[in-house]
Interface confidence: low
Amino acid sequence: MRTEAQVPALQPPEPGLEGAMGHRTLVLPWVLLTLCVTAGTPEVWVQVRMEATELSSFTIRCGFLGSGSISLVTVSWGGPNGAGGTTLAVLHPERGIRQWAPARQARWETQSSISLILEGSGASSPCANTTFCCKFASFPEGSWEACGSLPPSSDPGLSAPPTPAPILRADLAGILGVSGVLLFGCVYLLHLLRRHKHRPAPRLQPSRTSPQAPRARAWAPSQASQAALHVPYATINTSCRPATLDTAHPHGGPSWWASLPTHAAHRPQGPAAWASTPIPARGSFVSVENGLYAQAGERPPHTGPGLTLFPDPRGPRAMEGPLGVR
């Protein structure tokens, strides 16, 4: 189960101002416009799963929804990497994977998504309110990070569906499908705008009831509104920080997912600026960042999502790289 793309709440226009354009016709261009504006913006999604059979066992899955090619993925907990977070795993498409306790198994699921199994007991056990963050470095988009945690009051044993819900995939078919829909939407929007350009435009009341941070693809705030979201990073209970873990055992059984598709708007004006927002009725935590590279230098073109597929998604030289964890 995952939160669906949400559109900011639109207040109905004031009586008498709706004119010939019906409410439905008004909302549709607005939605399409935001879709068109954000169509090219990458997104990172994070899913955190707790095994019902072993409450100290977590699986984190992260994916990158963008057309660029991924040059590095970093998974951390306790906050963003570099902002108090502790690195759990680093996945490099060529040089392989390295991980640190209590991470048990990090792997590439596709060329644009990874999974990490975390296991511990006692001091090394992750807490239910632990924040996990995934950072994707990609060319040419830059650095994108999203964080997620488990809802605090859920019972994995009771609420567990037998299988995880469908997961967003940034493979070629998905990209082409979404691109097609967005292209059609943009064309339709232009058609609507031309059709209604001579009609009186209704005035929209700004919504004061949903000051949410950007976490859905359908809403890309401007840089100005984004700047207003910069808040100190309120993190987790630090008593759940990692210790060392000597043993790890695989666990099966049903599981439940807290999936957080997050949207990150470009903020080239400064270093890691964090926006965090609780998701209503889910108790999860989302943070997004785009840190553009210091020198704005080129990032190397290489095999990315939907291009050449290798048997090992890490690429042709994955096993000759120095850092493969075997």
Partner: antibody
């Protein structure tokens, strides 16, 4: 302060052995990859051996089978055991750290000199 | 093995000059390339990592660019303390390999 200090260099005869040590401080040694790099007088830099945080070791063809890199995380120490030494192994040997990310050696020791001569 | 070809092997320049050093990889290395400065009797010091990112504490007159197989180190305005030997290092795959070095001398 992040610091690497090499020791163990000296004069050795061809065919002999030598063990270099590198003492690390100021960072979590067990997390990072470590390397040995050498430089003959007036020459360029040559990577000699690497060991990742899982203990996996890597060598170029020029020293494979003769040199052995190892680490002792409890002592924050890196070692290079050099056997069957040749005159061409004469150089300054540097210990270098490669952090979690980005790749590449970001911290270097000051080096220890190894001279292979009869 | 990935060969790193660095050019020129040496150059003479004056203070204030703009200096460019190039490194070519024999195969694509993404952006897994660093630039190092070494002065006589000293250990190398990293200036640039990931092809284009400036190492903390390094002057902004140093910049790096490139990706795949072609990389460039640029010193925008050469200073007296910049006369040294510069090396590139590919860290994409083992064996790690350095360029042959570029000695920057005073004209």
């Amino acid at each position: 302060e992040v610091q690497l200090v090499e020791s163990g260099g000296g004069l050795v005869q061809p065919g002999g052995s030598l063990r270099l040590s590198c003492a690390a401080s100021g960072f979590t040694f067990s997390r990072d990859d470590m390397h040995w790099v050498r430089q003959a007088t007036g020459k360029g830099l040559e990577w000699v051996a690497g060991i990742d945080n899982a203990g996996e070791t890597y060598y170029p063809g020029s020293v494979k089978g003769r040199f052995t890199i190892s680490r002792e995380n409890a002592k924050n120490s890196l070692y290079l055991q050099m056997n069957s030494l040749r005159a061409g192994d004469t150089a300054i040997y540097y210990c270098a750290r490669e952090g979690q990310w980005p790749y590449g050696m970001d911290v270097w020791g000051q080096g220890t000199t190894v001279t292979v001569s009869s | 093995d990935i060969q790193m070809t660095q050019s020129p092997s040496s150059l003479s320049a004056s203070v204030g000059d703009r200096v460019t050093i190039t490194c070519r990889a024999s195969q694509g290395i993404r952006n897994d390339l660093g630039w190092y400065q070494q002065k006589p009797g000293k250990a190398p010091k990293r200036l640039i990592y990931s092809a284009s990112s400036l190492q903390s504490g390094v002057s902004s007159r140093f910049s790096g660019s490139g990706s795949g197989t072609e990389f460039t180190l640029t010193i925008s305005s050469l200073q007296p303390e910049d006369f040294a030997t510069y090396y590139c290092l590919q860290s994409n795959s083992y064996p790690l390999t350095f360029g042959g070095g570029t000695k920057v001398e005073i004209k």
